[in-house]
Interface confidence: low
C-alpha cells in the first residue's frame, strides 16, 4: 500500500537516523549525515512501510578500479510516494541515492509525466561525502501548488551510461470542483423540453451536482458529476447554475439565461432611399429578433389613392441586408410602405407606414387613331392623332415625338420632330418624292418617351400624280 | 486601423477629366455592408457629398453631377477610384474619400485627410 | 434634395459654457442625421449619428437631440480644444446633404 502523506503531518525528524524518506533493507546503505550539515527540507513526508520491495531500475557495477570487490547495486532510496495537499500549498519532496565515490560527475535530473523538468524549477541537489560513499539529496520544492502540478515526479541519475530511475512520487493537488462543462445560454421554444449539461472535477472526487433555478435547487439529491438536467418546459425566461461539491467545498457555475422564442418587435426607422419612376429603395431597422433569428421580412405597399382598389402588394426579401428595392411601380404614384419580418415563431407586426413617392415615368401607351394623308398643293403630309388614353398619367405630358422613316430605291432616312402637349395634329415637309413615308408618334413627359404607336405608310408619288386618301392606324376596339 | 488616402493631380485646366485614387487599409471591400464614397469641401461651398460605391458593386452618384461622375473599385487593391468629366473652376475644391461600415446608419465614420484641385486656365 | 439648414454661421462662447448648434431639414428625415466636427487643417470626424448616438471615443459632453425635423448639436462644458467647425448630414436618402457649418469660436 502507498503511505499518503497528508497535509497535516508533522515534518519528519531529521537527525539522527537515516535519510529522510529512506528505506532500510540492507545494512551496507545505511549511512548517518553530519550534524553540521545545514540542510533543512522545508517539509518532509513519512517513509513507507518497511519490507516494500524496489521496482526501479538498478545499477550493478562490475568491480572497483582494483578489479578486486564487488560494489552493492546502485538505486534510489525509497521515499513518500503519493503527496496529498491543497491548491495554494507550498511543497517539498526528495530522492536520495549513496553512490561510492568512484563515480564522478553525478547529476540528477528531475522528470514529471514523462518529461524533463527544465528551467525555473526549484531543484536543489546536496551532496554528503564520506570515506566510500557520497550521499546525494535531490529536493524538488513547489510554491503554491495548482492543479496542473498534479502528476508523477521521479529522478533519473546517470552514471558509467546506465540510468537510475526513483520511484514516482504522486502528487494529488486537491481544491474546490473545477468546471469541465458549464450550461450555456439558450433560446428555447416555450412549453418544450430542454436539457442542460454540467461536469465538474476533483480531486477530490466524487463531485456531486445541485442545480439551481431562479436562485432555487431544482434536484433536493445531489447527482454525480457529470449531470444532465432536462427541463420539461419554460413558459418565462429563467436563470439557471450549478452548484459543483466536493469535500473541499462548493463552485457555483455562472448563471445562464434561458430565453423563450417569441415573434420579433416589428421593424423600425424605415427609410427612403431613392426613387424612380417605377421602384423605390427602402431601408429599415430590424426590431427585437425575438431570441430567434430572422428568416426573412415582408415589403408590404399600399397605393394612396382614393381610386385604387386598396390592394396591398406584398414582397418578400432575405432578412439581410435590411435593404429591398421594391419594383413594378406606377409613376408618378404616393404610397404607403410597412416591413414586417419573421422568425421560427412567426411574424412580427407591422412597422410604422411610410410615405413614398414614385417619380414621373415615361408614358406607357402609345397615342390614338393616326392618321396621315399628304396635302400636294403644299408638299407635306399631315398628320393628325388623338391624345393617349390612360387610366392615370405616368406624369405631365410635355408633347409628342414623330418618327417619320422615308425608304426609297433602297435608301432609308429617318428623321424625329418634337411638338407641344397641346398639339394633336402636324405637318412634316415631304423630304422624298416617289417614296414610303412611315410615320410613329409617342407621348412624351419629363420622365421620357413613351411607346411609339404602330407605324402608318404613306406613298408619296412623283410631282404632279396625286392620291388624296389618307393612311391611318384605327382607334382601340374600332378595328 | 482604419486609414484612407485620397490621391489626385493637385492642378487640371478647364474641360479635363480629374481621376482620383482612394486607397485604404485596415478594412476590405469585400467585407458585407462596407462602403467608400466621395465628398468634396469647397472654400465657399462647404461639403458636397458626389458618390457612393458599395460592396456590392452598387454605385449612387448626386444627381446635380450624375453626368460627369464615375465612381468605380478595384476590390484586390483596395481601392475606389473617381473619374469627373469636362471640369470647370467650380469643382476646384478639396477631394476626401470616406468608409461608411455596416450599411446602416449610413454615416463616414473614417475619413481621409483630403487632396486639394485647382482647375485653372 | 433634401436641404440641410444651419442658420448660425459662427457662434462665439467661453470655456466651461454650454452652447447648441442646430440644424433644420427641409423634409422628414427619422433620426438618419449624423453630425461632423471638422478642426482647422483636417477632414471632418464623426461625433454623433442616428441623432443621438455618441460615436466611440466621443466625450460625453457632446450629446444630440432632436425636434421634428430640427435637430441640435449641445456641447455642455466647452474646452478649447472644441474650437472647430461643426456640419450635421442627413443620410435618410440620396443623395446626401450636408449643412453648410457652424464655426464655434472660443473667447
Known amino acids: 500500500a502507498i503511505t499518503e502523506a497528508r497535509e497535516e503531518a508533522k515534518p519528519y525528524p531529521l537527525f539522527p537516523g537515516p535519510l529522510p524518506g529512506s528505506l532500510q533493507t540492507d545494512h551496507t546503505s545505511l549511512l548517518s549525515l553530519p550534524h553540521t550539515s545545514g540542510y533543512q527540507p522545508a517539509l518532509m513526508f513519512s517513509p513507507t512501510q518497511p519490507g516494500r520491495p524496489y521496482t526501479g531500475n538498478v545499477a550493478i557495477p562490475r568491480v572497483t578500479s582494483a578489479g578486486s570487490k564487488l560494489l552493492p547495486p546502485l538505486a534510489f532510496k525509497h521515499t513518500v510516494g503519493h503527496i496529498i495537499l491543497s491548491e495554494h500549498k507550498d511543497v517539498k519532496f526528495n530522492c536520495s541515492i549513496s553512490v561510492p565515490n568512484i563515480y564522478q560527475d553525478t547529476t540528477i535530473s528531475w522528470w514529471k509525466d514523462g518529461k524533463e523538468l527544465l528551467g525555473a524549477h526549484h531543484a536543489i541537489t546536496q551532496f554528503y561525502p564520506d570515506d566510500e560513499v557520497t550521499a546525494i539529496i535531490a529536493s524538488f520544492s513547489i510554491t503554491s501548488v495548482q492543479r496542473s502540478d498534479n502528476g508523477s515526479y521521479i529522478c533519473k541519475m546517470k552514471i558509467n551510461n546506465e540510468e537510475i530511475v526513483s520511484d514516482p512520487i504522486y502528487i494529488e493537488v486537491q481544491g474546490l470542483p473545477h468546471f469541465t462543462k458549464q450550461p450555456e445560454s439558450m433560446n428555447v421554444t416555450r412549453n418544450t423540453a430542454f436539457n442542460l449539461t454540467c461536469q465538474a472535477v476533483g480531486p477530490p472526487e466524487p463531485v456531486n451536482i445541485f442545480w439551481v433555478q431562479n436562485s432555487s435547487r431544482v434536484n433536493e439529491q445531489p447527482e454525480k458529476s457529470p449531470s444532465v438536467l432536462t427541463v420539461p418546459g419554460l413558459t418565462e425566461m429563467a436563470v439557471f447554475s450549478c452548484e459543483a461539491h466536493n469535500d473541499k467545498g462548493l463552485t457555483v457555475s455562472k448563471g445562464v439565461q434561458i430565453n423563450i422564442k417569441a415573434i420579433p418587435s416589428p421593424p423600425t426607422e424605415v427609410s427612403i432611399h431613392n426613387s424612380t419612376a417605377h421602384s423605390i429603395l427602402i431601408s429599415w431597422v430590424p426590431g427585437f429578433d425575438g431570441y430567434s433569428p430572422f428568416r426573412n421580412c415582408s415589403v408590404q405597399v399600399k397605393e394612396v389613392d382614393p381610386l385604387s382598389n386598396g390592394s396591398v402588394m406584398i414582397f418578400n426579401t432575405s432578412a439581410s441586408p435590411h435593404m429591398y428595392q421594391i419594383k413594378q411601380l406606377q409613376a408618378l404614384a404616393n404610397y404607403s410602405i410597412g416591413v414586417s419580418c419573421m422568425n421560427e415563431i412567426g411574424w412580427s407586426a407591422v412597422s410604422p407606414w411610410i410615405l413614398a413617392s414614385t417619380t414621373e415615368g415615361a408614358p406607357s401607351v402609345a397615342p390614338l387613331n393616326v392618321t396621315v394623308f399628304l396635302n400636294e398643293s403644299r408638299d407635306n403630309v399631315d398628320i393628325r392623332w388623338m391624345k393617349p388614353l390612360t387610366k392615370r398619367q405616368a406624369g405631365e405630358l410635355v408633347g409628342y415625338r414623330i418618327s417619320h422613316v422615308w425608304q426609297s430605291a433602297g435608301i432609308s432616312k429617318e428623321l424625329l420632330e418634337e411638338v407641344g402637349q397641346n398639339n394633336s395634329r402636324a405637318q412634316i415637309s415631304v423630304q422624298v418624292h416617289n417614296a414610303t413615308c412611315t410615320v410613329r408618334i409617342a407621348a412624351v413627359t419629363k420622365g421620357g418617351v413613351g411607346p411609339f404607336s404602330d407605324p402608318v405608310k404613306i406613298f408619296i408619288p412623283a410631282h404632279g400624280w396625286v392620291d388624296h386618301a389618307p393612311s391611318s392606324t384605327p382607334a382601340p376596339g374600332n378595328a | 486601423q482604419v486609414t484612407l488616402r485620397e490621391s489626385g493631380p493637385g492642378i487640371l485646366q478647364p474641360s479635363q477629366t480629374l481621376s482620383l485614387t482612394c486607397s485604404f487599409s485596415?478594412?476590405?471591400?469585400?467585407?458585407?455592408?462596407?462602403?467608400v464614397g466621395w465628398i468634396r469641401q469647397s472654400s465657399g461651398k462647404g461639403l458636397k457629398w458626389l458618390a457612393h460605391i458599395w460592396w456590392d458593386d452598387d454605385k449612387f452618384y448626386n444627381p446635380a453631377l450624375k453626368s460627369r461622375l464615375t465612381i468605380s473599385k478595384d476590390t484586390s487593391k483596395n481601392q475606389v477610384f473617381l473619374k469627373i468629366a469636362n471640369v470647370d473652376t467650380t469643382d476646384t475644391a478639396t477631394y476626401y474619400c470616406?468608409?461608411?461600415?455596416?450599411?446602416?446608419?449610413?454615416?463616414?465614420?473614417?475619413w481621409g485627410q483630403g487632396t486639394p484641385l485647382i482647375v485653372s486656365s | 434634395d433634401i436641404v440641410m439648414t444651419q442658420s448660425q454661421k459662427i457662434m462665439s462662447t467661453s470655456v466651461g459654457d454650454r452652447i447648441s448648434v442646430t440644424c433644420k431639414a427641409s423634409?422628414?428625415?427619422?433620426?438618419?442625421v449624423v453630425w461632423y466636427q471638422q478642426k482647422p487643417g483636417q477632414s471632418p470626424k464623426a461625433l454623433i449619428y442616428?441623432?443621438?448616438y455618441r460615436y466611440s471615443g466621443v466625450p460625453d459632453r457632446f450629446t444630440g437631440s432632436r425636434s421634428g425635423t430640427d435637430f441640435t448639436l449641445t456641447i455642455s462644458n466647452v474646452q478649447s480644444e472644441d474650437l472647430a467647425n461643426y456640419f450635421c448630414?442627413?443620410?435618410?436618402?440620396?443623395?446626401?446633404?450636408f449643412g453648410s457649418g457652424t464655426k464655434l469660436e472660443i473667447k
Open positions: 470616406a468608409r461608411i461600415e455596416g450599411g446602416l446608419p449610413y454615416y463616414y465614420d473614417y
Open positions: 442616428s441623432t443621438s
Open positions: 485596415g478594412f476590405s471591400l469585400n467585407t458585407f455592408g462596407m462602403g
Open positions: 423634409q422628414i428625415v427619422g433620426t438618419n
Open positions: 448630414q442627413q443620410y435618410n436618402s440620396y443623395p446626401f446633404t
